[in-house]
Interface confidence: low
């Protein structure tokens, strides 16, 4: 079963006249007629064996035919056959006059004829149009033809029948010749057998569908090449099917037991040591400074009160710190200072005694400061000025000449980070390379002291005497600095009062 | 029982992205047997198929429609999905949908869609 | 690729047999190829599958929802209808065509009067 085509391109009939001679009124309107039969050595009237069809009117003389296929299918026309292709064909195209609108044949003229070609040869089946081009002494017929066969046919003959599929019966198309070809994923004689994953087991895994792998009971995965282990199994593996292999630091029959508490749960705090004393347990072994079942407290060394004579005590990383009042130092504040007696003004200080001559005061001449004048007033030593800027003394006084790009007593701001005044709550800023830094005041934290970290324990003001009040951050408790005359954590007692302490 | 949770609602302009996370409750082990698949549904209609992914080995497959702007993956450490949509458009107003999808399937006894997220809307308006 | 069509509505009364259908059309337009899946959705919640591979159900689905398939349908069948099965319901299927995808039926509003 198959369709020859024939494609008319293009007729001419300059003069407009009938095979005759005979010109036409008002011009030629030119339709065809078409007869497709067997070889014939010499093409005869008769039959049309293999059909026949006929055109409405093209045009008028001359004119070129347009390719109608999408618009109704008038051109290429169309003559199929259900029977095998021979190869081989005549064929007769006529070119009729139709003065009115009744192209029937006993409705025309005799004389209506305006040229009649015929040709035969053998043709085979193909996608390829052969084009031809039969000329008469005054029409010229320029057409193009070919033979293809129907959906569904196939071969050199159109007689080998093959229908693509894709259902439960085959997943197949059509090759040129007819035979099939599985669509992917599928194969067999009749491409009824899927192609199961690339990789998927042969033994554990088998699948319904092409690229699927659907495993057997007990195994999983993509390739159905993992065991399932045991129903319930939480910290195993398997080998084969419901095992239940307990990985390292487990055991019991599902491998729920904890045998490594340490390694799963880092129970243990602020760097102590852990180790493992059974099933869900172990002990912490702590760093100094610390206690707890988890070393999560930290011991205060200040609880034992080391600071004597009214010294506070500050905790530090590697210990405590006593800060002593006026008139006491050592370790524990446990010394009471000097007395002008013993000369402790340098470089030409004067010695004051206060408070009875329990401690005392060094008066320093210009150029000399600390407490006992030992120390040159040479304010560039300590090289105050930052960002490579140029420190300058000036008297009792210094300051600093700045780099380009940078201001502050000190140069320490970048001017164009820190101009816009980021530190919040008072923080003082500093530029760096690649940006600026907060130095928070008391209290407060973050990149821009924007986050109030803790009480002011000098809030209440709990000094007395008219002391300075510090907070330490670290504790969140407060010092006490005394005016002379005044001693205790809290500046409460006079000196000439000493407070009576159980040691 | 294996739960999926997603992610809040998310108003976006047209042109925008979006992407919806879903999380599985449950074992590591668990959710890497499975395949997550995205399904949306515009107010009145009926379920439409976006793509999935295998949890497993993190293979993929999109709606034709969509291949181009759609793109799902998948963080086993979190045992959670993600699909995100791009130069999205007001038609893409939806609630999208994470399923548990049957591929790989262990053993064959789960079945494509299973268990459902409870669904994101996504409202794309200027 | 593959359409898969549905009634828009179907009704009945308490007691009653409903059965909901679901025609394949295009290029693989027999649906005996494929399985075919079956969801019931509630109002305001995500779909839950009733049916899968043509006529199995899940554990915890009552055995008055039924799944058939022959050709190019594929039928839901609910026996003793329930006023709380009222609900939308959606046929689903794979389809081969492309790279593969997953196909939604337009949905049948089932009400129980």
């Known amino acids: 079963s198959g369709v020859f085509q024939l494609q008319l391109q293009e007729f001419i009939n300059e003069r407009g006249v009938l095979a005759s001679g005979r010109p036409c009124e008002p011009g030629c309107r030119t339709f065809f007629r078409v007869c497709l039969k067997h070889f014939q050595a010499v093409v005869s009237p008769g039959p049309c064996t293999f059909g026949t069809v006929s055109t409405p009117v093209l045009g008028t003389n001359s004119f070129a035919v347009r390719d109608d296929s999408s618009g109704g299918g008038r051109n290429p026309l169309q003559l199929p056959f259900n029977f095998t292709w021979p190869g081989t064909f005549s064929l007769i195209i006529e070119a009729w006059h139709a003065p009115g609108d009744d192209l029937r044949p006993e409705a025309l003229p005799p004389d209506a004829l305006i040229s009649k070609i015929a040709i035969q040869g053998s043709l085979a089946v193909g996608q390829n149009w052969l084009l031809d081009e039969q000329t008469s002494t005054l029409t010229r017929l320029r057409y193009s033809y070919r033979v293809i066969c129907s959906d569904n046919y196939y071969g050199d003959n159109c007689s080998r029948l093959c229908k693509k599929r894709n259902d439960h019966f085959g997943h197949y198309v059509c090759q040129p010749d007819g035979n099939l070809s599985c669509l992917p994923g599928w194969t067999g004689e009749y491409c009824q057998q899927p192609i199961c994953l690339s990789g998927c087991h042969e033994q554990n895994g088998y699948c319904s569908k092409p690229a699927e792998c659907l495993c057997r009971p007990g195994w999983q995965g993509r390739l159905c090449n993992e065991c399932i282990p045991h129903n319930g199994c939480r910290h195993g593996t398997c080998s084969t099917p419901w095992q239940c292999t307990c990985d390292e630091g487990w055991g019991g029959l599902f491998c729920d037991q904890d045998l490594n508490y340490c390694t799963h749960h880092s129970p243990c705090k602020n760097g102590a040591t852990c180790s493992n004393s059974g099933q869900r347990s172990y002990t912490c072994t702590c760093r100094p400074g610390y206690t707890g079942v988890d070393c999560e407290l930290e011991l205060s060394e200040c609880d034992s009160n080391p600071c004597r004579n009214g010294g506070s005590c500050k905790d530090q990383e590697d210990g405590y710190h006593c800060l002593c009042p006026p008139g006491y130092y050592g370790l524990h504040c446990e010394h009471s200072t000097l007395s002008c007696a013993d000369s402790p003004c340098f470089n030409g200080g004067s010695c004051r005694e206060r408070n009875q001559g329990a401690n005392y005061a060094c008066e320093c001449p210009p150029n000399f400061t600390g407490s006992n004048c030992e120390k040159k007033v040479d304010r560039c030593t300590s090289n105050p000025c930052a960002n490579g800027g140029q420190c300058l003394n000036r008297g009792p006084s210094r300051m600093c000449r700045c780099r380009p790009g940078f201001t502050g007593t000190y140069c320490e701001l970048h001017v164009s980070d820190c101009a816009r005044n980021p530190c919040a709550h008072g923080g003082t800023c500093h530029d760096l390379e690649n940006g600026l830094m907060c130095t928070c005041p008391a209290g407060f934290s973050g990149r821009r002291c924007e986050v109030r970290t803790s009480i002011d324990a000098c809030a209440s003001s709990p000094c007395f005497n008219r002391a300075t009040c510090y907070t330490d951050l670290s504790t969140d408790t407060f010092v006490c600095n005394c005016p002379y005359g005044f001693v205790g954590s809290r500046c409460e007692f006079p000196v000439g009062l000493p407070p009576s302490f159980p040691w | 029982q294996v739960q999926l949770v997603q992610s809040g609602a998310e108003v976006k302009k047209p042109g925008a992205s979006v992407k919806v996370s879903c999380k599985a409750s449950g074992t590591y082990r668990t959710f890497t047997n499975y395949g997550i698949t995205w399904v949306r549904q515009a107010p009145g209609q009926g379920p439409e198929w976006m793509g999935w992914i295998s949890a497993y080995n993190g293979n993929t497959n999109y709606a034709q429609k969509l291949q181009d702007r759609v793109t799902v993956t998948t963080d086993t450490s979190t045992s959670t999905a993600y699909m995100e949509l791009r130069s999205l458009r007001s038609d893409d107003t939806a609630v999208y949908y994470c399923?548990?999808?049957?591929?790989?399937?262990?053993?064959?006894?789960?079945?494509?869609?299973?268990?459902w997220g409870q669904g994101t809307m996504v409202t794309v308006s200027s | 690729q593959s359409v898969l069509t549905q009634p828009p509505s179907a009704s009945g009364t308490p007691g009653q047999r409903v059965t909901i259908s679901c025609y394949s059309s295009?290029?693989?337009?027999?649906?005996?190829?494929?399985?075919v899946y079956w969801y019931q959705q509630l109002p305001g919640t995500a779909p839950k599958l009733l049916i899968y591979?043509?006529?199995q159900r899940p554990s915890g689905v009552p055995d008055r929802f039924s799944g058939s398939e022959s050709g190019t349908s594929a039928s839901l069948a609910i026996s003793g209808l329930r006023s709380e099965d009222e609900a939308d319901y959606y046929c689903?299927?794979?389809?081969?065509?492309?790279?593969?995808?997953?196909?939604f039926g337009g949905g049948t509003k089932l009400t129980v009067l």
């Open positions: 399923a548990r999808d049957r591929v790989p399937r262990i053993p064959v006894t789960t079945e494509a869609f299973d268990i």
């Open positions: 295009g290029s693989s337009s027999n649906i005996g190829s494929y399985f």
């Open positions: 591979r043509n006529n």
């Open positions: 689903a299927a794979w389809d081969d065509s492309l790279s593969g995808h997953w196909v």
